[in-house]
């Protein structure tokens, strides 16, 4: 059966998953969804890793942890009730039916006050060819539920030396958690 | 608007206890990592401690078996429990929001406190 | 002993440009993590003046800019101003520590 979280009408909701990398420079691909997990990859994704870096997400949809050390926990910026339903967390484990899955119940509740616009987190981006216009001094700040679907293809390299994480300490959050290796 | 404000400093003495509090607003701890550094009178900063996300905590080395950090998500804050202080714990303490990007791309920006003093002295 | 390597000091004549280097290792800059600088004066809390490598909060001038390549970051002061006198400190993460990493920090002195 699925985990349970829960989060307010326009407040930011996170569902944890984490894992441990095997040996060092070791991340394995990740992918989020809407929706159970299927038997294969993630249906309706809305964010994904690789073994270097997140290479893919879709607005409202973040990583705010330590992804390279396994901490995969995503967040939802600005929920509405719509966000409401399962979510799949898929620690993509190479070799045939390897892959850990974990199904996490999100559950929307009505703000108990009617929040005011206030914007919670700032995404700000420093490609200019992507969101903003050259020469016009800083990039601009943006929320995340502005920003149109990304897919990075070309992003900065992790070196081989990574060390062992020491990420899988005793969560208090009895989020998803596995260890690799 | 995102406010980290720290509370609880003041003067103690050696093997003494003492406890910070970090009240944020405009974020939720839950699902952030906050951190406490430290500078020491005319140094550097240094890393003290984090909870991440989920409430996993982390510590320096020079804190461990000594400091605990938590969170209450009700209030919204974070705490530092310092036990059996030295001399050397003498620093301010700042509370702070820390944040991961990739490649240049962040879900926010780091922010601190104004911090707040703690003397070890005897 | 700081974990990221920042020279002591630096100096330069009001207008001129100066940089400032932040050298990592591959286990921090050079594993992917981004790096953010502070400016620090004399009995304040640190100011955030660049955040991942390049991007400048709302109300920094635009004569900082920062920048990372490999496993070392740059913050560079173009047009120095009398009030740039203060220390710098570049922070990142590393693989090593779920926690943050510190430059030593960079005194800079205009002339």
């Known amino acids: 059966s699925e985990v349970e979280y829960r989060a307010e009408v326009g407040q930011n909701a996170y569902l944890p998953c984490f894992y441990t990398p095997a040996a060092p420079g070791n991340l394995v691909p990740v992918c989020w969804g809407k929706g159970a997990c299927p038997v294969f990859e993630c249906g309706n994704v809305v964010l994904r890793t690789d073994e270097r870096d997140v290479n893919y997400w879709t607005s409202r949809y973040w990583l705010n942890g330590d992804f390279r050390k396994g901490d995969v926990s995503l967040t939802i910026e600005n929920v509405t009730l719509a966000d409401s339903g399962i979510y799949c967390c898929r620690i993509q484990i190479p070799g045939i039916m390897n892959d850990e899955k974990f199904n996490l119940k999100l559950v929307i509740k009505p703000a108990k006050v009617t929040p005011a616009p206030t914007r919670q987190r700032d995404f700000t981006a420093a490609f200019p060819r992507m969101l903003t216009t050259r020469g016009h001094g800083p990039a601009e700040t943006q929320t995340l539920g502005s920003l149109p679907d990304i897919n990075l293809t070309q992003i900065s390299t992790l070196a081989n030396e990574l060390r062992d994480s020491r990420l899988a300490n005793d969560l208090r959050d009895s989020g998803a958690t596995i260890r690799i290796g | 608007e995102v406010q980290l404000v720290e509370s609880g400093g003041g003067l103690i003495q050696p093997g003494e206890s003492l406890r910070l509090s970090c009240a944020v607003s405009?974020?939720?701890?839950?699902?952030?990592?906050v951190a406490w550094v430290r500078q020491a009178p005319g140094k550097g900063l240094e890393w003290v401690a984090t909870?991440?996300?989920?409430?996993?905590?982390y510590y320096a080395d020079s804190v461990k078996g000594r400091f605990t950090i938590s969170r209450d998500d009700s209030k919204n804050t974070v705490d530092l429990q310092m036990n059996i202080l030295r001399v050397e714990d003498t620093a301010i303490y700042y509370c702070?929001?820390?944040?991961?990007?990739?490649?240049?791309?962040?879900?926010?920006?780091?922010?601190w406190g104004q911090g707040t003093t703690v003397t070890v002295s005897s | 002993q700081a974990v990221l390597t920042q020279p002591p000091s630096v100096s330069g004549a009001p207008g001129q440009r100066v940089t400032i280097s932040c050298t990592g290792s591959?286990?921090?800059?050079?594993?992917?993590?981004?790096v953010h600088w502070y400016q620090q004066l004399p009995g304040t809390a640190p100011k955030l003046l660049i955040y991942?490598?390049?991007n400048r909060p709302s109300g920094v001038p635009d004569r900082f800019s920062g920048s990372k390549s490999g496993t070392s970051a740059s913050l560079a002061i173009t047009g120095l101003q009398a009030e740039d006198e203060a220390v710098y400190f570049c922070?990142?993460?590393?693989?090593?520590?779920?926690?943050?990493?510190f430059g030593g920090g960079t005194k800079v002195t205009v002339l």
């Open positions: 702070a929001r820390d944040t991961y990007c990739t490649a240049g791309i962040c879900p926010s920006s780091p922010v």
């Open positions: 405009g974020f939720t701890v839950r699902g952030n990592y």
């Open positions: 909870i991440n996300g989920g409430g996993s905590p």
């Open positions: 591959s286990s921090n800059i050079g594993a992917g993590y981004d």
């Open positions: 991942g490598n390049s």
């Open positions: 922070q990142s993460h590393d693989t090593s520590v779920t926690g943050v990493v």
